[in-house]
């Protein structure tokens, strides 16, 4: 049976993005001049509405390559573009609980 997707907020949202996006990182910090449109988007979607893994994937900094798309050059971001790196505190077990909720 179809089950509505879950909401993710705060650190749980960050950790889940961290796992989904891996080395690619993801759009995270607020630029000095204005809120990042992507950042605002994922908060509105995932925390205040509902979220699934496919949506999370769209916020990764560099799109995942598919086998059919090996020629596409990687996305190049400016050096100062805010991305969230894989953190030393990230815990797989904690993320696994979150992603299991999203998969159900």
């Amino acid at each position: 049976a179809y089950r509505p997707s879950e909401t993710l907020c705060g650190g749980e949202l960050v950790d889940t993005l961290q796992f989904v996006c891996g080395d690619r990182g993801f759009y995270f910090s607020r630029p000095a001049s204005r809120v990042s449109r992507r950042s605002r988007g994922i908060v509105e979607e995932c925390c205040f509405r509902s979220c699934d893994l496919a949506l999370l994937e769209t916020y990764c900094a560099t799109p995942a390559k598919s086998e059919r798309d090996v020629s596409t050059p990687p996305t190049v971001l400016p050096d100062n573009f805010p991305r969230y790196p894989v953190g030393k505190f990230f815990q797989y077990d904690t993320w696994k609980q979150s992603t299991q909720r999203l998969r159900r």
Epitope: C9, G10, G11, E12, V14, V35, R40, V43, C47, F48
Partner: antibody, heavy 122, light 107 residues
Framework: EVQLLESGGGLVQPGGSLRLSCAAS???????IMWWVRQAPGKGLEWVS?????????LYADSVKGRFTISRDNSKNTLYLQMNSLRAEDTAVYYC???????????????WGQGTMVTVSS | DIQMTQSPSSLSASVGDRVTITCRAS??????LNWYQQKPGKAPKLLIY???TLQSGVPSRFSGSGSGTDFTLTISSLQPEDFATYYC?????????FGQGTKVEIK
Amino acid sequence: EVQLLESGGGLVQPGGSLRLSCAASGFTFSNYIMWWVRQAPGKGLEWVSVISSSGGGTLYADSVKGRFTISRDNSKNTLYLQMNSLRAEDTAVYYCARDNGDYVGEKGFDIWGQGTMVTVSS
Amino acid sequence: DIQMTQSPSSLSASVGDRVTITCRASQSISNYLNWYQQKPGKAPKLLIYTASTLQSGVPSRFSGSGSGTDFTLTISSLQPEDFATYYCQQSYNSPWTFGQGTKVEIK
């Protein structure tokens, strides 16, 4: 100077209503997720509600869900909390606070107002 | 909901003492733990976020550590202005919850 200033508190009878306001200054209000947190006399802190930077998303603690409504007017740099069907247990100092991060509270609340006292009593 | 438990609930210390306050979460919260200081009649003040990051303007005598479920706030050398109540808060998910507070009093 970055500042939040609450107003609208007071004495109200059980079942009554009150609207709190929080005026923001010194920063770009529309860029920030905003919060209401309360503290009953002599007690600890309790999260009440949060609103997204655009105002399009809101969340509430179970204790106030269906009775309180958070909103904001970015053109006026003001956050609101409409409180209906008030109960004695809602008696507290109500603080507005600014989110320190981007993903809803993950870095805590960095700027707080001075608080406004709400007393629910007959 | 994630429950946050602080210990001790109160402590007495002297100026210059090293003070340690602990906070335990009822489930793993990674490093999403914040510490606040509150003085009587005043709003809370953010000291440390994500377990160990010192908020801008906070003196370096404050430090935080821990991950998972166990966290610590340390004041390396207690100053007169540090006598206050300290709260931990988990920012891992909703509902965002606080510890019950630790009151640091003058011995």
